[in-house]
Interface confidence: medium
Amino acid sequence: HNTTVFQGVAGQSLQVSCPYDSMKHWGRRKAWCRQLGEKGPCQRVVSTHNLWLLSFLRRWNGSTAITDDTLGGTLTITLRNLQPHDAGLYQCQSLHGSEADTLRKVLVEVLADPLDHRDAGDLWFPGESESFEDAHVEHSISRSLLEGEIPFPPTS
């Protein structure tokens, strides 16, 4: 799996999308988990509705929401009021029994809010470093890293 980088600004919302083959994953619930360490577990943050037919309903856990377009094959995760410690490595997963298949590996980067001067002496502001190749701007900036970048250990 490639790893896709999504950038968001502290205090704002970040939307992460994970496309998948809707036929291959038909009937499967989805989840969003955080990779805590190189060989550590992928800790479940939030999962879609217990009833697969209701997967389109947004489910929240704290400031993180998940919703699944099962026909279009797009899982969407929203991180509301993004904070520095939300930055990290995550996975979109497709669940079947006690197993989980990785749909997408995601690196969330949190940029400082240019209008927040509390720690301005230490923070990086958007625009100070080179832009991503092939970046597209929506609610987030995302790009795919090269094959083999940011290896994830197997989900435990």
Epitope: G37, H85, G88
Partner: antibody, heavy 122, light 106 residues
Framework: EVQLVESGGGLVQPGRSMMLSCSAS????????MAWVRQAPTTGLEWVAS????????YYRHSVKGRFTISRDNAKSTLYLQMDSLRSEDTASYYC???????????????WGQGVMVTVSS | DIQMTQSPSLLSASVGDRVTLSCKAG??????LAWYQQKLGEAPKLLIY???ILQTGFPSRFSGTGSGTDFTLTISSLQPEDVATYFC????????FGGGTKLELK
């Protein structure tokens, strides 16, 4: 096996410059956030600077901002710390460290180099 | 900066003892806390992260507990090779380290 090897330390006069290097092996260097952490008998362990993967964002502690510059050369798997306008309070062992993904400047540091001593004195 | 206070600064214990090291944060750091082991003349090694997850390679006699402001590192049965200085680090808000606890054998 993950290995981080620092070089470039030594004795330097106040106001002068020094460059530290850290050669990384045993992992895909370009994939990881990296950092410099220093340790002095008086101040203990202090995070100094970090650089992210991907966008290469850089972060510094207040006391070194504008004087120190962290950079990386992914092709050479090498991390650098350019230290200018050095002060006596910068005297410490400097460690190159790999950091896990999170936060602005630092999450936890999962691998450290053996450290290199920097002494700022006239 | 969030101040991290470790106690005691020096701890003498015997082989086989159950050893408890304390780390207190000046404000809530949730579970964003790591412990490091540093042996004399060596670099620190990550021991525990996220307050209670043991880093691969360390024996199960090491464990971490706590959340918020009070954290504990426990060695269930002290071994000679555990002699070292132990540091805690918070990474909830920027990052700061404790002053360390030096653990020695009686």
């Amino acid at each position: 096996e993950v290995q981080l090897v620092e070089s470039g330390g030594g004795l330097v006069q106040p106001g002068r410059s020094m460059m530290l290097s850290c050669s990384a092996s045993g992992f895909t260097f370009s994939n990881y956030h990296m950092a410099w952490v220093r340790q002095a008998p008086t101040t203990g362990l202090e995070w100094v600077a970090s650089i992210t993967t991907g966008s290469g964002n850089t972060y510094y502690r207040h006391s070194v901002k504008g004087r120190f510059t962290i950079s990386r050369d992914n092709a050479k798997s090498t991390l650098y710390l350019q230290m200018d306008s050095l002060r006596s309070e910068d005297t410490a062992s400097y460690y190159c460290a790999r950091r896990w993904y999170g936060g602005y400047e630092g999450y936890y540091f999962d691998y450290w180099g053996q450290g290199v001593m920097v002494t700022v004195s006239s | 900066d969030i101040q991290m206070t470790q106690s005691p600064s020096l701890l003498s214990a015997s082989v086989g003892d159950r050893v408890t090291l304390s780390c207190k944060a000046g404000q809530n750091v949730n579970n964003y806390l790591a412990w490091y082991q540093q042996k004399l003349g060596e670099a620190p090694k990550l021991l525990i992260y996220n307050a209670n997850i043991l880093q691969t390679g360390f024996p199960s006699r090491f464990s971490g507990t706590g959340s918020g402001t009070d954290f504990t590192l426990t060695i269930s049965s002290l071994q000679p090779e555990d002699v070292a200085t132990y540091f805690c680090q918070q990474y909830n808000s920027w990052t700061t380290f404790g002053g360390g606890t030096k653990l020695e054998l009686k």
